[in-house]
């Protein structure tokens, strides 16, 4: 019932599940300099009945020994084939965490967790895509992918999404040099936009690094 592959990777896009189907596993990963406690769980598991779902197990990280401070926790070999990384939600995430039947919501952060969350999705899981800030979707409407079982094999449907980063350089009033517009880089967000997350901050790097917008550590 676990999906064999990752959801499709779309250049300059990120994906997220609205909720996680029962059976989904989340690796207990720790940030650099920390490791799982010796008796700690390898993963959290979304379990439940028809009326309520919740995450079993708790992830706990402890400080690594001095000689191991640069060592990151990695999944066990049997875990590695279904690594799906998704963003960590901001503790200030302005989304209600009410439950959906048969699904678990995003687990709350645990102390010293890694900057990326690695999920192991199950058949029937849907993920939604969004172009990263500074890129535009060429198609209208939502973009989503579902893990399906076909002839005994799992596959993810291909989302209808192309994110373009065509540049529009223009002289911004009061600036000495031109800046790229949001097709490539947000131009005026520092003065005209207030945001609740690192969405815009991350894309300051995106124009040159093409980094994911959702891999920042909790502040």
């Amino acid at each position: 019932e676990l999906c064999d592959d990752d959801p499709p990777e779309i250049p300059h896009a990120t994906f997220k599940a609205m909720a996680y189907k029962e059976g989904t596993m989340l690796n207990c990963e720790c940030k650099r300099g920390f490791r799982r406690i010796k008796s700690g769980s390898l993963y959290m598991l979304c379990t439940g009945n028809s009326s309520h779902s919740s995450w079993d197990n708790q992830c706990q990280c402890t400080s690594s020994a001095t000689r191991n401070t640069t060592k990151q926790v990695t999944p066990q070999p049997e875990e590695q084939k279904e690594r799906k990384t998704t963003e960590m939600q901001s503790p200030m995430q302005p989304v209600d965490q009410a439950s959906l039947p048969g699904h678990c919501r995003e687990p709350p952060p645990w102390e010293n967790e890694a900057t990326e969350r690695i999920y192991h999705f199950v058949v029937g899981q849907m993920v939604y895509y969004q172009c990263v800030q500074g890129y535009r979707a060429l198609h209208r409407g939502p973009a989503e992918s579902v893990c399906k079982m076909t002839h005994g094999k799992t596959r993810w449907t291909q989302p209808q999404l192309i994110c373009t980063g065509e540049m529009e350089t223009s002289q911004f009033p009061g600036e000495e040099k031109p800046q790229a517009s949001p097709e490539g880089r947000p131009e005026s967000e520092t003065s005209c936009l207030v945001t609740t997350t690192d969405f815009q901050i991350q894309t300051e790097m995106a124009a040159t690094m093409e980094t994911s917008i959702f891999t920042t550590e909790y502040q």
Epitope: T14, V95, Y128, Q130, C131, A137, C192
Partner: antibody, heavy 122, light 107 residues
Framework: QVQLVQSGAEVKKPGSSVKVSCKAS????????ITWVRQAPGQGLEWMGG????????SYAQKFQGRVTITADESTSTAYMELSSLRSEDTAVYYC???????????????WGQGTMVTVSS | DIQMTQSPSTLSASVGDRVTITCRAS??????LAWYQQKPGKAPKLLIY???SLESGVPSRFSGSGSGTEFTLTISSLQPDDFATYYC?????????FGGGTKVEIK
């Protein structure tokens, strides 16, 4: 076809707050932005900010910084706009609208709510 | 902020007329411009996105053109249902801004 249904008209005192809801029926938010736009009587349209419900990213126009909070409840497909420290010039029709593509909150708006009239008067 | 200037602010026309509304941006916005129609007491309705793409379900008599700083909305043959106010919107740079509107009224 998704429809956006907004809460009813409100009459508020200066200095108070108002919270307007916007429920999507006939579909979920998925990853499309929900934006709030207001229109004072006889005036044009003014963008306040927006949110991508699933991703939780809210963007606000600086004009409303510190006064507006946009949130979303994915489980009920409802977005909310709360405006505080109301003054008479906040009297307007407040619209929610859905983004036309998954391009963050910097988008055009293909589906609109019916509008909520907020009157601020002492 | 990017200023969007629409002209004319009011336009008197008759059924069957070809109508053109202009929208100018204070700086280049590439093609990230939308046009909306609004009738009294109603929410705006998207007509055109990305400067020239016709929204699904919108009659083909509506068309949009332009890029950079100058854009036009054209109604090839004005119909009774088209008397309304039209707004342009730029979504190239935050904050999103709208033009002041063009009211198309019966001559």
């Amino acid at each position: 076809q998704v429809q956006l249904v907004q809460s009813g008209a409100e009459v508020k005192k200066p200095g108070s707050s108002v919270k307007v809801s916007c429920k999507a029926s006939g579909g979920t938010f998925s990853s499309l932005a929900i934006t709030w736009v207001r229109q004072a009587p006889g005036q044009g349209l003014e963008w306040m900010g927006g949110i991508i419900p699933i991703f939780g990213d809210a963007s606000y126009a600086q004009k409303f910084q510190g006064r507006v909070t946009i949130t979303a409840d994915e489980s009920t497909s409802t977005a909310y706009m709360e405006l505080s420290s109301l003054r008479s010039e906040d009297t307007a029709v407040y619209y929610c609208a859905r983004g036309g593509s998954v391009s963050g909150t910097l988008v055009d708006f293909d589906i609109w709510g019916q509008g909520t009239m907020v009157t601020v008067s002492s | 902020d990017i200023q969007m200037t629409q002209s004319p602010s009011t336009l008197s026309a008759s059924v069957g007329d070809r109508v053109t509304i202009t929208c100018r941006a204070s700086q280049s916005i590439s093609s990230w411009l939308a046009w909306y129609q609004q009738k009294p007491g109603k929410a705006p309705k998207l007509l055109i996105y990305k400067a020239s793409s016709l929204e699904s379900g919108v009659p083909s008599r509506f068309s949009g053109s332009g890029s950079g700083t100058e854009f036009t909305l054209t109604i090839s043959s004005l119909q009774p249902d088209d008397f309304a106010t039209y707004y342009c919107q730029q979504y190239n740079i935050y904050p999103i801004t709208f033009g002041g509107g063009t009211k198309v009224e019966i001559k």
